[in-house]
């Protein structure tokens, strides 16, 4: 696959994946109630992470949103933080990923640049589908825990005990929004990695280490910035190289390409 | 105006089959649940089936599920009761319920049709 | 099922007068989602078939005259009539229309002293 297609392929994918993030971050079928082996209920109740809903009979929907942040679960809080961070970082990938498409020319961006743009947005969409995939889990893993500890009393209070009036337990189980948010963390992590590995092969081989050349009394010198260590021209691992008097030129001028041992 | 009209009641003997049937107007049938709730003679109230608007919910009584079975045709805004088995504790008035938007309510109700099982 | 208890079976009481009847429920009607009670009360006149008074436990039906109000919560509901009328004659009944299947009280009878 050419590298235009991969980034441009990972770029769609973590869209498209973060486009599912905020949907299901903002859908409120997170938690529904479970009709199996229950009291049949004359209301469908189902929550998000924002309100709560009631479906009547009817049809008739009637949603309430949580007007509180101290009385909520830590970890309802925790989610909420996790997609949040998630929609954000996707954003940010977003902005950067577009400068960085090999398809769209913005000023005099050489590749460089752009690879490490890529490999930038990469890794937010990567983060940022990890995010949406714990903050998903964490909420199922609550559900879950829940819907045991309902199970096991599914009737608070002892009915007929003492005379103690029995309360409907309602009982929540897996709502579509977790499968959306599965799957959109799940194409975002996937894009990312597409975006990372579409940044390999925009990197030219050289592109990281432009070696400047510069004429030294008698011997021919290759200073190097980043590696500060200088090689004579007579190493095995050397090659001739045009020196020009009173100027340096980097080794792109004249298209050599270092092997992997050039430079340590 | 809402109007609900039942018919199809009548004597039966124990053991026999009835077919009600309530004829809906004054409101778009296909977007409403109803009701069948019964009166025995001098007695209280008695819910005894629903079916959604898209028939995907049908709930009964316990005392007449195997029995009694409801239906609807919203092309036709018909609604119907088909009830086997008839024993003497179903003779009542039965009646057609629309049920409201808000609150699971009913909150309009036929003349209802007298249904009479004796031998 | 939810078994539905009214009291007093029947009350007789001067026109003009305050009166309240009651209904208890076997099980909680309150449901958390959306702070509700599934109850709802009917009046049903000699003759007629009955007729939706009051849902939500307290909100009146349109039409239906201010003096009659629903209050309660959870299992334990009441209806009020504040200045009885002589067209409040009648069988008022309440019902649970929050688990399948909706049951009924046995109804209160209100008559006229």
């Known amino acids: 696959m050419s590298v235009t297609a991969c980034q441009g392929l990972g770029f769609v994918v973590s869209l498209i994946g973060f486009a599912g993030i905020i949907a299901a971050t903002c859908m409120d079928q997170w938690s529904t109630q479970d009709l199996y082996n229950n009291p049949v209920t004359a209301v469908f109740n189902y929550q998000g992470l924002w309100r709560s809903c009631v479906r009547e009979s009817s049809g008739f929907t009637e949603c309430r949103g949580y007007f509180t942040l101290l009385g909520l679960p830590a970890m309802l809080q925790a989610v909420r933080a996790l997609m949040i961070v998630g929609i954000v970082l996707g954003v940010i990938g977003i902005l950067v990923s577009i400068f960085a498409l090999k398809c769209i020319r913005i000023g005099s961006m050489d590749d460089s640049a752009k690879a490490k743009m890529t490999l930038t947005s990469g890794i937010l969409f990567i983060i940022s589908g990890i995010c949406a995939i714990i903050g998903v889990s964490v909420f199922a893993n609550m559900l879950v825990t829940n819907f045991w500890m309902s199970t096991a009393n599914m009737y608070s209070g002892m009915g007929g005990m003492g005379g103690m009036v029995q309360t409907v337990q309602t009982r929540y189980t897996f709502g579509a929004a977790l499968f959306v948010g599965w799957v959109a963390g799940g194409l975002t992590l996937i894009g990312g990695v597409m975006m990372c590995i579409a940044c390999r092969g925009l990197t030219p081989d050289d592109s990281n280490f432009k070696a400047v050349s510069y004429h030294a009394s008698g011997q021919n010198v290759a200073y190097r910035p980043g590696g500060f260590k200088a090689s004579t021209g007579f190493g095995s691992n050397t090659r001739n190289k045009k020196i020009y008097d009173g100027g340096a030129r980097t080794e792109d001028d004249e298209q050599s390409h270092p092997t992997k041992y050039d430079y340590v | 105006e809402v109007q609900l009209v039942e018919s199809g009641g009548g004597l039966v003997q124990p053991g026999g089959s009835l077919r009600l049937s309530c004829a809906v107007s004054?409101?778009?049938?296909?977007?409403?649940?109803m009701h069948w709730v019964r009166q025995a003679p001098g007695k209280g109230l008695e819910w005894v089936a629903y079916?959604?608007?898209?028939?995907?919910?049908?709930y009964y009584a316990d005392s007449v599920k195997g029995r009694f079975t409801v239906s609807r045709d919203n092309a036709k805004n018909s609604l119907y009761l088909q009830m086997n088995s008839l024993r003497a504790e179903d003779t009542a008035v039965y009646y057609c319920?629309?049920?409201?938007?808000?609150?699971?309510?009913?909150?309009?109700w036929g003349q209802g049709t007298l249904v009479t099982v004796s031998s | 099922d939810i078994v539905m208890t009214q009291s007093p079976d029947s009350l007789a009481v001067s026109l003009g007068e305050r009166v309240t009847m009651n209904c208890k429920s076997s099980?909680?009607?309150?449901?958390?989602?959306?702070?509700?009670?599934?109850l709802t009360w009917y009046q049903q006149k000699p003759g007629q078939p009955p007729k939706l008074l009051i849902y939500?436990?307290?909100t009146r039906e349109s039409g239906v005259p201010d003096r009659f109000s629903g209050s309660g919560s959870g299992t334990d509901f009441t209806l009020t009539i504040s200045s009885v009328q002589a067209e409040d004659v009648a069988v008022y009944y309440c019902?649970?229309?929050?688990?399948?299947?909706?049951?009924f009280g046995q109804g209160t009878k209100l008559e006229i002293k």
């Open positions: 319920v629309r049920s409201g938007y808000y609150g699971n309510s009913l909150d309009y």
């Open positions: 004054g409101f778009t049938f296909s977007s409403f649940g």
């Open positions: 079916i959604s608007s898209g028939t995907t919910n049908i």
């Open positions: 099980q909680s009607l309150f449901n958390s989602g959306n702070q509700r009670n599934y």
């Open positions: 939500w436990a307290s």
């Open positions: 019902q649970n229309v929050y688990i399948y299947p909706l049951t």
